[in-house]
Interface confidence: low
């Protein structure tokens, strides 16, 4: 019976390890600076890295500019968006700016597209200063279903900071849906 | 056999409890106001509390101003940095400020230091207002290896808000590395 | 003995599933726009949704404007607060604003109230621009005991953005207290 117990213990140790390591989904996506849209209008950002530097993804999918959920659950979502301008880049079209981010959820299966989180600020980036910078951070806890897509919209995309430590978004699963 | 089953169940209950409570590493470190550097240059902040008020640490180490990872894993890292100035503190050296935070990762094994996250804003803190305040929040999900160190750099350290609810950073482990 | 082993395995599978799904507490509360206080003074926000749109709560309680902890643990707390003003709403009482959020913890057992996190900015919302916007995000990892209450205080509540994607706060349990 001891051998049997050892076998039970062994199999459970495997299960416990597997369960613990069972790859809770996550993603940390960083801006792809080679393909940032121009202009000052509100756009959806579609070019992100998922596999270089700090960018990583597991049990989620990145496709067509969207982070796709593969596993139902409650996730913590976050985004950090940095805007900057140096006078050497030329004059701004306007000194009064609305620097915004919108984190949206879209489902093709069930018709819906909604903004989960937004943040930002109106700014007066005067010509009196040679450099301007501003960062936005948002985060929240949301129920996500398999097949749903997370995307990022920003205003003034041409002002985005292209560094991987500056402009990124991500998600990690915290718990199952009951 | 029933006693044996009870023993198996009992040992597994312990394991399950241990596994669940198995002290996922975390830290929440608050600024040590008695030792904030002066000046307006960019500096690494080395004085943080880890064991008073809201500050807590478990299965991580705080040493020489750095948060040291003891357990491989994917962690959520965050920082909240508040800057403030009151006219009673005297005039600012300049009214045009760059208030920034950089969350960096250093590895001793592979000598390197990288910025994981940055945030902040350029500000015009005019003499027309007696009080100025600004807060930055950043957060993200990163793979950390045992022995790696997390540190915080800021510009204008003399303007930091010394309250424990204002200037802090932290981390908590979310999942293992596969 | 095989049947006995199967029984042990079966019961443990149940326990493992229950343990995994065991409803770690969380809440995501969104502003109730029908009941936002007026004025520019600092107030506690008491009207939040917990059961519509993105707002959800599980194994925590919302009562009297406060988020009540039902289960001891270490929680990640966060808040996102957006302020806005359009000239069509009339002139601001003052163009120099202090836009702030305070996340506080109150304990009934040990009568006390403490600020866990604060964030915000002083702003100059000049009449030269027809629209102004500003968002604050704060987040941190805290030990919470059953019966403790989390609440949100803001300055200038009349300027709050009433959208569910703009003004919200929440919490999710990450781990037990050892």
């Amino acid at each position: 019976i001891r051998a049997e117990k050892a076998m039970v213990d062994g199999s459970w140790l495997d299960l416990a390890k597997r369960s613990k390591l069972e790859a809770q989904p996550f993603a940390h996506l960083t801006i792809n600076a080679t393909d940032i849209p121009s202009g000052s209008h509100k756009v959806s950002l579609s070019s992100w890295y998922h596999d270089r530097g700090w960018a990583k993804i597991s049990n989620m999918t990145f496709s067509n500019g969207k982070l796709i959920v593969n596993q139902d659950g409650f996730y913590y979502l976050y985004a950090n968006i940095c805007f900057r301008h140096h006078e050497t880049s030329g004059d701004l079209a306007t000194e009064y700016l609305q620097l915004m981010v919108y984190v949206t959820k879209t489902s093709i299966k069930i018709p819906s597209s909604h903004t989960l989180m937004k943040g930002g600020s109106t700014k007066y980036w005067s010509g009196n200063s040679e450099f301007h910078f501003y960062s936005i951070n948002v985060g929240g806890f949301f129920k996500l279903r398999s097949g749903e897509e997370i995307s990022i919209e920003v205003s003034n995309p041409s002002l985005l900071d292209p560094d991987q430590d500056a402009t990124y978004f991500g998600a990690f699963k915290v718990r199952d849906i009951d | 056999i029933r006693a044996e089953k009870a023993m198996v169940d009992g040992s597994w209950l312990d394991l399950a409890k241990r596994s669940k409570l198995e002290a996922q590493p975390f830290a929440h470190l608050t600024i040590n106001a008695t030792d904030i550097p002066s000046g307006s240059h960019k500096v690494s902040l080395s004085s943080w509390y880890h064991d008073r008020g809201w500050a807590k640490i478990s299965n991580m180490t705080f040493s020489n101003g750095k948060l040291i990872v003891n357990q491989d894993g994917f962690y959520y890292l965050y920082a909240n940095i508040c800057f403030r100035h009151h006219e009673t503190s005297g005039d600012l050296a300049t009214e045009y400020l760059q208030l920034m935070v950089y969350v960096t990762k250093t590895s001793i094994k592979i000598p390197s230091s990288h910025t994981l996250m940055k945030g902040g804003s350029t500000k015009y803190w005019s003499g027309n207002s007696e009080f100025h305040f600004y807060s930055i929040n950043v957060g993200g999900f990163f793979k950390l290896r045992s022995g790696e160190e997390i540190s915080i750099e800021v510009s204008n350290p003399s303007l930091l808000d010394p309250d424990q609810d204002a200037t802090y950073f932290g981390a908590f482990k979310v999942r293992d590395i596969d | 003995i095989r049947a006995e082993k199967a029984m042990v395995d079966g019961s443990w599978l149940d326990l493992a599933k229950r343990s995994k799904l065991e409803a770690q507490p969380f809440a995501h509360l969104t502003i109730n726009a029908t009941d936002i206080p007026s004025g520019s003074h600092k107030v506690s926000l008491s009207s939040w949704y917990h059961d519509r749109g993105w707002a959800k709560i599980s194994n925590m309680t919302f009562s009297n404007g406060k988020l009540i902890v039902n289960q001891d643990g270490f929680y990640y707390l966060y808040a996102n607060i957006c302020f806005r003003h359009h000239e069509t709403s009339g002139d601001l009482a003052t163009e120099y604003l202090q836009l702030m959020v305070y996340v506080t913890k109150t304990s009934i057992k040990i009568p006390s109230s403490h600020t866990l996190m604060k964030g915000g900015s002083t702003k100059y919302w000049s009449g030269n621009s027809e629209f102004h916007f500003y968002s604050i995000n704060v987040g941190g990892f805290f030990k919470l005991r059953s019966g403790e209450e989390i609440s949100i205080e803001v300055s200038n509540p009349s300027l709050l953005d009433p959208d569910q994607d703009a003004t919200y706060f929440g919490a999710f349990k990450v781990r037990d207290i050892d």
Epitope: D72, S107, I110, P111, S112, T115, R145, S146 | - | -
Partner: antibody, heavy 117, light 110 residues
Framework: EVQLLESGGGLVQPGGSLRLSCAAS????????MNWVRQAPGKGLEWVSS????????YYADSVKGRFTISRDNSKNTLYLQMNSLRAEDTAVYYC??????????WGQGTLVTVSS | QSVLTQPPSASGTPGQRVTISCTGS?????????VHWYQQLPGTAPKLLIY???WRPSGVPDRFSGSKSGTSASLAISGLRSEDEADYYC??????????FGGGTKLTVL
Amino acid sequence: EVQLLESGGGLVQPGGSLRLSCAASGFTFSNTWMNWVRQAPGKGLEWVSSISVNSNYIYYADSVKGRFTISRDNSKNTLYLQMNSLRAEDTAVYYCARDSEYAFQNWGQGTLVTVSS
Amino acid sequence: QSVLTQPPSASGTPGQRVTISCTGSSSNIGAGYDVHWYQQLPGTAPKLLIYDNEWRPSGVPDRFSGSKSGTSASLAISGLRSEDEADYYCATWDDSLHWVFGGGTKLTVL
């Protein structure tokens, strides 16, 4: 307070057309999916059509596909349903419903469409 | 013929507990889509009663509860009251890109 007010219903002959409107207030219309649901006299609820925030996703029930067109004007906070080639079986109370996540959170009071010769 | 099947009628006396079932298929409820319940009082528009299988909107008494398992869902009403007399509809999304409703259940409080 969320309000949805349908209008445009009435009596129409088979083969005729009608345009229903739904005026929305009390929420950010431009951020919300909208829907039409109908209920024939003495019968149950039947979904008719859904439209996304910026009109790039549109869905119809098989029973109305090719005959009905859903549209919206976010600047006017108004939802529309253009109904062509009407049949007797289209007789119903038509409700405008606001989508909140995946459920119909708010409903209008409805407008009656009668198709009869 | 509705895609989701509900009993046409149900009844109970005040104070009793009543359950209404809603049966779908692998292309809707069984595909993992959430089930929502609507209450329609006589002569009025429908009102959301339960969403996402089990969640109650503000103002809905906790006497109403919902659950889902496999290809079925159910609505339970405990402590039945006369004002609960109404038609009840379940609804969910279907892989055919359609919203689908149950045929409705007329609840009578005896």
